[in-house]
């Protein structure tokens, strides 16, 4: 669904200030496209409130109208509120923009629950805390919506960063990032560091919190530690990747690897949870329950519904296992693994119990549309969307939440044969590619 699982999403406080970030280990990576090193003007340009999305400030039109826009690697439309709505403090007013051009075409995007619809046009767009450029981009002006905008979320639109194939109404509508690359000298690469809170935020903290960084045009080495490991983008629609193995505390789930990617596996900043296909979810939960069996939790907790609370500062992180996903590597028969902690997959929820409590929701859930590596995964890592080289990179994030005993990890290489067989081939007659709602 759009609400609660696809969106809203969570953010939180950023990691240590730049001066306190851990130094990156040297490595022997092949050269990367784009500017290397520092993108100071883009660091910490994302904000968000717990469970409600990571957003970047953008300006639209002439004179510029400032809006907060949710960063979503799981869709491909740039769409903004363009009419009054009870949950919007501001919206795009096309009539006030001298550079707005109407495309005289409508767009309708239904989700499993909820929808938005609007009118297509183009206008001048820039990102104040991004590259110093202005581009003419397609904009869907949202005139009607249901269960799309979130009360108090502080964002007024969505920036779909995936490929044209899944753009609405069809793949002829050029996505924002394609326009940006075409009209400027910016390299075809961006990277995301989403910084989860790791503890519940009260409303004051949440409003003031910094959520991370979207680096447009390259890689900022201050945002990660260790080396970057890359997995191929299987197909340019969603950011589709291939998972070849799943472990819970080092124990292999021992499933046919096709199950992990049924019917696809994607990296999606607009989804809160790590979402797994039904069979995989059931096996993973069984394994997580077994690993944490010294304590039992209510059935509704494992469904992502009930919250479990502990006295502030006493959350027993050690009883929960780590989750490792092995991703296809760039070299034949080679994979690498990314490992997340319970600090990533137990999502802090504020304002439910007392201030003496830390409360969490289980943020691994069941999917009928494949694996979705949402914020739960991304908050552990610096994720590089290297479109130019059709690959996605993962490194340990300098702002990920951990404890003194365990840390998120990106490790390799591992020898894994027949990885190509792990990809699921969607039948041509299947209409699942037309589904926008990711239930």
């Amino acid at each position: 669904t759009h609400l609660g699982i696809r969106l809203p999403l969570r953010s939180g406080l950023a990691g240590p200030p730049l001066g306190l970030r851990l130094p990156r280990e040297t490595d022997e990576e092949s050269e990367e496209p784009g500017r290397r090193g520092s993108f100071v003007e883009m660091v910490d340009n994302l904000r968000g409130k717990s469970g409600q999305g990571y957003y970047v400030e953008m300006t639209v039109g002439s004179p510029p109208q400032t809006l907060n826009i949710l960063v979503d690697t799981g869709s491909s439309n740039f769409a903004v509120g363009a009419a009054p709505h009870p949950f919007l403090h501001r919206y795009y007013q096309r009539q006030l923009s001298s550079t707005y051009r109407d495309l005289r075409k409508g767009v309708y995007v239904p989700y499993t629950q909820g929808k938005w619809e609007g009118e297509l046009g183009t206008d001048l767009v820039s990102i104040p805390h991004g590259p110093n450029v202005t581009v003419r981009a397609n904009i869907a002006a949202i005139t009607e919506s249901d269960k799309f905008f979130i009360n108090g979320s502080n964002w007024e639109g969505i920036l779909g960063l995936a490929y044209a194939e899944i753009a609405r109404p069809d793949d002829s509508l050029e996505p924002f990032f394609d326009s940006l690359v075409k009209q400027t000298h910016i390299p075809n690469i961006f990277s995301l560091q989403l910084c989860g809170a790791g503890f519940p935020l009260n409303q004051t903290e949440a409003l003031a919190s910094v959520g991370g960084s979207m680096i447009i045009g390259g890689i900022d080495h201050s945002l990660y530690t260790g080396r970057l490991w890359y997995t191929p983008i299987r197909r340019e629609w969603y950011y589709e990747v291939i998972i070849v193995r799943v472990e819970i505390n080092g124990q292999d789930l021992k499933m046919d690897c096709k199950e992990y990617n049924y019917d696809k596996s994607i990296v999606d900043s607009g989804t809160t949870n790590l979402r797994l296909p039904k069979k995989v979810f059931e096996a993973a939960v069984k394994s997580i329950k077994a690993a944490s069996s010294t304590e039992k939790f209510p059935d509704g907790f494992w469904l992502g519904e009930q919250l479990v609370c502990w006295q502030a500062g006493t959350t027993p992180w050690n009883i929960f296992p780590v989750i490792s996903l092995y991703l296809m590597g760039e070299v034949t028969n080679q994979s690498f693994r990314i490992t997340i902690l319970p600090q990533q997959y137990l999502r802090p929820v504020e304002d439910v119990a007392t201030s003496q409590d830390d409360c969490y929701k289980f943020a691994v859930s069941q999917s009928s549309t494949g694996t979705v590596m949402g914020a739960v995964i991304m908050e552990g890592f610096y994720v590089v969307f290297d479109r130019a080289r059709k690959r996605i990179g993962f490194a340990v994030s300098a702002c990920h939440v951990h404890d003194e005993f365990r840390t998120a990890a990106v490790e390799g290489p591992f020898v894994t044969a027949d990885m190509e067989d792990c990809g699921y081939n969607i039948p041509q007659t299947d209409e699942s590619t037309l589904m926008t709602g990711r239930a």
């Epitope: 009930q306 919250l307 609370c309 119990a353």
Partner: antibody, heavy 120, light 108 residues
Framework: QLQLQESGPGLVKPSETLSLTCTVS??????????WGWIRQPPGKGLEWIGN???????YYNPSLKSRVTISVDTSKNQFSLKLSSVTAADTAVYYC????????????WGRGTLVTVSS | EIVLTQSPATLSLSPGERATLSCRAS??????LAWFQQKPGQAPRLLIY???NRATGIPARFSGSGSGTDFTLTISSLEPEDFAVYYC??????????FGGGTKVEIK
Amino acid sequence: QLQLQESGPGLVKPSETLSLTCTVSGGSISSSSYYWGWIRQPPGKGLEWIGNIYYSGSTYYNPSLKSRVTISVDTSKNQFSLKLSSVTAADTAVYYCARLGHGYSYFDLWGRGTLVTVSS
Amino acid sequence: EIVLTQSPATLSLSPGERATLSCRASQSVSSYLAWFQQKPGQAPRLLIYDASNRATGIPARFSGSGSGTDFTLTISSLEPEDFAVYYCQQVYVWPPRTFGGGTKVEIK
């Protein structure tokens, strides 16, 4: 069928420790399907949750009572116990033990309760 | 903290009448809500769990409804043994800790 029975002194002096035991009969306290808990009810007032325990010894306490509460389990005797230290008159209540079932979520079976009066 | 407010505090009805009791949560508790019945000198008894499911052995005249923040316990036709105090409890936040203040159903 499974039954719960509270036992312990009915009168405790202020500043002392209240100690109660709940005996589970007709079933095993070591069942992986349940937590076991304590709830109290001051005379003429509502219900207040005190805490829960799993047979492994894992405990959860009401934050407002945590500094004074200890719940323990003795699987060999099929019992679990409550200790509440530094009691005052405000701790005078009927104390119930109960089973937390239905996916560890609901108190589906209760003991009859025992009145504990705190008075010198 | 989630606060449960029950209303009315007292409900005066005659046997055979329909009783409607309300429980309102200060924020959404999904459908994780229970209703208990307590008679004088007795322990509470679970009537309804997950907002609308009757517990084992509970007569069909008891029904629960609602989700989110507003919940209702309905007794379709009051029997003499139904005059008691009724409590709601949320278990959305676990471990379950919050009870409502109670509604007393008394004979008119």
